[in-house]
Amino acid sequence: MDSFNYTTPDYGHYDDKDTLDLNTPVDKTSNTLRVPDILALVIFAVVFLVGVLGNALVVWVTAFEAKRTINAIWFLNLAVADFLSCLALPILFTSIVQHHHWPFGGAACSILPSLILLNMYASILLLATISADRFLLVFKPIWCQNFRGAGLAWIACAVAWGLALLLTIPSFLYRVVREEYFPPKVLCGVDYSHDKRRERAVAIVRLVLGFLWPLLTLTICYTFILLRTWSRRATRSTKTLKVVVAVVASFFIFWLPYQVTGIMMSFLEPSSPTFLLLKKLDSLCVSFAYINCCINPIIYVVAGQGFQGRLRKSLPSLLRNVLTEESVVRESKSFTRSTVDTMAQKTQAV
């Protein structure tokens, strides 16, 4: 493949038609972006600012507590996944500004857009792990007292990350840079070429493993947890549960458009009008999914304010209060009083 260190003339305004108006000179003047792309840029900018700062703060708060607090381990890993994805945003932003021209080369094309999928799989697998933890705390409190430790939590996170990397491989492998002849533009995208079945298979696996199956299992899981919690009439604040439910719900809300358009595009002919319409919305769907990368710190702050009544504490201490609450009396040998809000009603503190 040719190297792409040349200046790209801007023919963006000819993207959707073959014919150039005889009265329109083929000049290099800049043209306006489509509305979905403008919205995507706004979302990307907000997500980057909130996501980088918010997740950095969460990492900073939870990193100190992760040795002894299991909840901190969960939230630390979620924040790392989100933070990593946010690092790709300036590149994706630049590409959209340049009418989807990709001057960053093949390696960046394979890695950077795949980060959001790595985030998706890592997040949902971590959320599944957290949900399993919440479930065990409610239904197997004795087992938790005996076996629920930081070491096991880290192993679970490592497994989640490993599986996430594995599930991201297809996207990574099929991403290519394509340099179009006219308008002169280098594009970064997936190319399955001869294998439409493989494209559909990847889209179906992504939909099932990254969305439908987790949606079903987590809905069932939290239905049981909430029913048990309400039936016991827990007097203690169930803030970790509320935070986790909010995080899980936001995951599915913000990934929905991406998953729906993705599965539709895999079953449509690339030249069909519906496919072309969905392709125009692609950046917006990706940006909407990217909201996941900044929403968690917002949820934590909102939750913290709710639990505090009003924002009396500093942001780090407010986050620490939300993210490092413990649910079992003796969590590890390094257990200290400071990591627990209250020691009462340990089996109901979910």
Partner: antibody, heavy 121, light 112 residues
Framework: QVQLVQSGAEVKKPGASVKISCKAS????????MNWVRQAPGKGLEWMGR????????KYNGKFKGRVTITADESTSTAYMELSSLRSEDSAVYFC??????????????WGQGTTVTVSS | DVVMTQTPLSLPVTLGQPASISCRSS???????????LHWCLQKPGQSPQLLIY???NRFSGVPDRFSGSGSGTDFTLKISRVEAEDVGVYYC?????????FGQGTKLEIK
């Protein structure tokens, strides 16, 4: 009517350079890409590069990068292709061909008559 | 680079009979704007190539209607409903979706 008239045949020694011209008429020279394609004896067609005469913007096939230079003179509606460091395998017929931007065709639609270049010591 | 593979490379045909040439690309030729820039040209003996079909199925001006093109994505076909003597030459498929522009190896049509 569209016409692309190329310069005459050339015989060159290995290591030398050759510069071929292609004079266009019958259409708006500026609103097109001028492409250069070569065909070795008994072989297929191979794209070398293109130029947008309006501003001199060029794109080359990576295979020829560094050896080929495409230029254009808007005032005479002429495109030029220079190939340096010639070797025997560069012996071929060289065609100029236009890609008109203001038509629905969006294909290389008209070709020059070809210029035969022979590289021999 | 996009590799264009033509079959057959040689095609002996009886006058008045139909002929078909296949072209397969190593990558999808669907442009980001939805169009497919796959073309067919004919190089008659001792002449320059001439455009026959552009964008898969559109006949270029002056091309007889016995020539037709079809296909999508990566698989394309040129059909001649009734071969005439003047159709003799080498047929090339080419793509102008991606840089560099690439051509098939050519299919030599000859009269039996």
């Amino acid at each position: 009517q569209v016409q692309l008239v190329q310069s005459g045949a050339e015989v060159k020694k290995p290591g030398a350079s050759v510069k071929i011209s292609c004079k266009a008429s019958g259409y708006a020279f500026s609103n097109s890409w001028m492409n250069w394609v070569r065909q070795a004896p008994g072989k297929g067609l191979e794209w070398m590069g293109r130029i947008y005469p309006g501003d001199g913007d060029t794109k080359y096939n990576g295979k020829f990068k560094g050896r080929v230079t495409i230029t254009a003179d808007e005032s005479t509606s002429t495109a030029y292709m220079e190939l340096s460091s010639l070797r025997s395998e560069d012996s071929a017929v060289y065609f100029c061909a236009r890609f008109l931007l203001i038509s629905t065709v969006t294909a290389v639609d008209y070709w020059g008559q070809g210029t035969t270049v022979t590289v021999s010591s | 680079d996009v590799v264009m593979t033509q079959t057959p490379l040689s095609l002996p045909v009886t006058l008045g009979q139909p002929a078909s040439i296949s072209c397969r690309s190593s990558q999808s030729l669907v442009h980001s704007n939805g169009n497919t820039y796959l073309h067919w040209c004919l190089q008659k003996p001792g002449q320059s190539p001439q455009l026959l079909i552009y964008k898969v199925s559109n006949r270029f001006s002056g091309v007889p209607d016995r020539f037709s093109g079809s296909g999508s994505g990566t698989d394309f076909t040129l059909k001649i409903s009734r071969v005439e003597a003047e159709d003799v030459g080498v047929y090339y498929c080419s793509q102008s979706t991606l840089v560099p522009l690439t051509f098939g190896q050519g299919t030599k049509l000859e009269i039996k």
